[in-house]
Amino acid sequence: SGTTNTVAAYNLTWKSTNFKTILEWEPKPVNQVYTVQISTKSGDWKSKCFYTTDTECDLTDEIVKDVKQTYLARVFSYPAGNVESTGSAGEPLYENSPEFTPYLETNLGQPTIQSFEQVGTKVNVTVEDERTLVRRNNTFLSLRDVFGKDLIYTLYYWKSSSSGKKTAKTNTNEFLIDVDKGENYCFSVQAVIPSRTVNRKSTDSPVECMGQEKGEFREI
């Protein structure tokens, strides 16, 4: 069904990283416009991106209200210039998205090594606690605030002079590792949520090596 010359959206896809969440769909509109609605299982549909010619809609503001809820979105198609028109079923043509649970499905963004500090044969590596768009009491929460102990970081480190990698894990944002005195090391970190079944790992952070600006070396 649907209004003449109006086609339903398809390939509705959630794109979400660190809770920044955008719904994308096809096709590029020809003589039609779209409106998006989003709801939890309560069925209280909220309209967003009214009568847009875009094929994406930023739904971050809605999903951050409760990242543990499961959401469904639907994209309505209307003829351009005649948005009151409805299909033969007495309602505009629409398509539903897959369900989306931000806490379980948002991609983990690429982490950043904030600093590393060597004290003798120990190196303290600190991962930047990235801010998300999730708010509590008018304050933006960090990734650690949101995920708590569900989030761990894996550190990959190796001597600059060799390729053999070692790993360490932490459920905070800091690592304290043993190194050989007089050797320079390189570091990369990865965010991981072990309890997840999908999107468990982030991409690796950019590599940082000792002897560069990020680090501090103190001989004891």
């Epitope: 069904s1 709801s39 299982k41 549909w45 079923a89």
Partner: antibody, heavy 118, light 106 residues
Framework: EVQLLESGGGLVQPGGSLRLSCAAS????????MAWVRQAPGKGLEWVSA????????YYADSVKGRFTISRDNSKNTLYLQMNSLRAEDTAVYYC???????????WGKGTTVTVSS | DIQMTQSPSTLSASVGDRVTITCRAS??????LAWYQQKPGKAPKLLIY???SLESGVPSRFSGSGSGTEFTLTISSLQPDDFATYYC????????FGGGTKVEIK
Amino acid sequence: EVQLLESGGGLVQPGGSLRLSCAASGFTFSSYAMAWVRQAPGKGLEWVSAISGSGGLTYYADSVKGRFTISRDNSKNTLYLQMNSLRAEDTAVYYCAKAPYGYYMDVWGKGTTVTVSS
Amino acid sequence: DIQMTQSPSTLSASVGDRVTITCRASQSISSWLAWYQQKPGKAPKLLIYKASSLESGVPSRFSGSGSGTEFTLTISSLQPDDFATYYCQQYKSYITFGGGTKVEIK
């Protein structure tokens, strides 16, 4: 355990009114849309009405529009169906159901019987 | 409104049989279809939603498939507890049920 318990059914004359209730327990009532579905004797299932979690959105089958009103009291975890101008063809078992997004019914009550007869 | 047509209306089968019930929609409903089981004097029970997603606690012998206008509920090996009436339901546009398929003992 998630449970739904309907009440308020009975025998009523054509043109009369009846109010069905559905008491919910075992889940966060306000977080789910709810629906009423009926089944006439020996017949199949017919969707009657649905309501969003906040009560702000309501939907009706054409066969009951203007006669039936769905509502909910989230403070009492209770769903209602006010049925006016009842007809013989409204005779059925009425089920209340938990309905994620208002789309499908994942938990059903045992049903309450409404008989419209003179 | 979208019409849902189930076939057959009655199906005779034996324990252990593979049983297939078909549901056709009058227009495309993508994958927005649910299947229910109902026994006499009891409330319906959700088996499948979104055409192929098995509801929690439902035995794996039940499976759903299809998209667009044609859908299938399959019981891989019929058990004594499976003799019942089965309904499909679309939720693409409002809600409509199929007329039901009664699975009876051969």
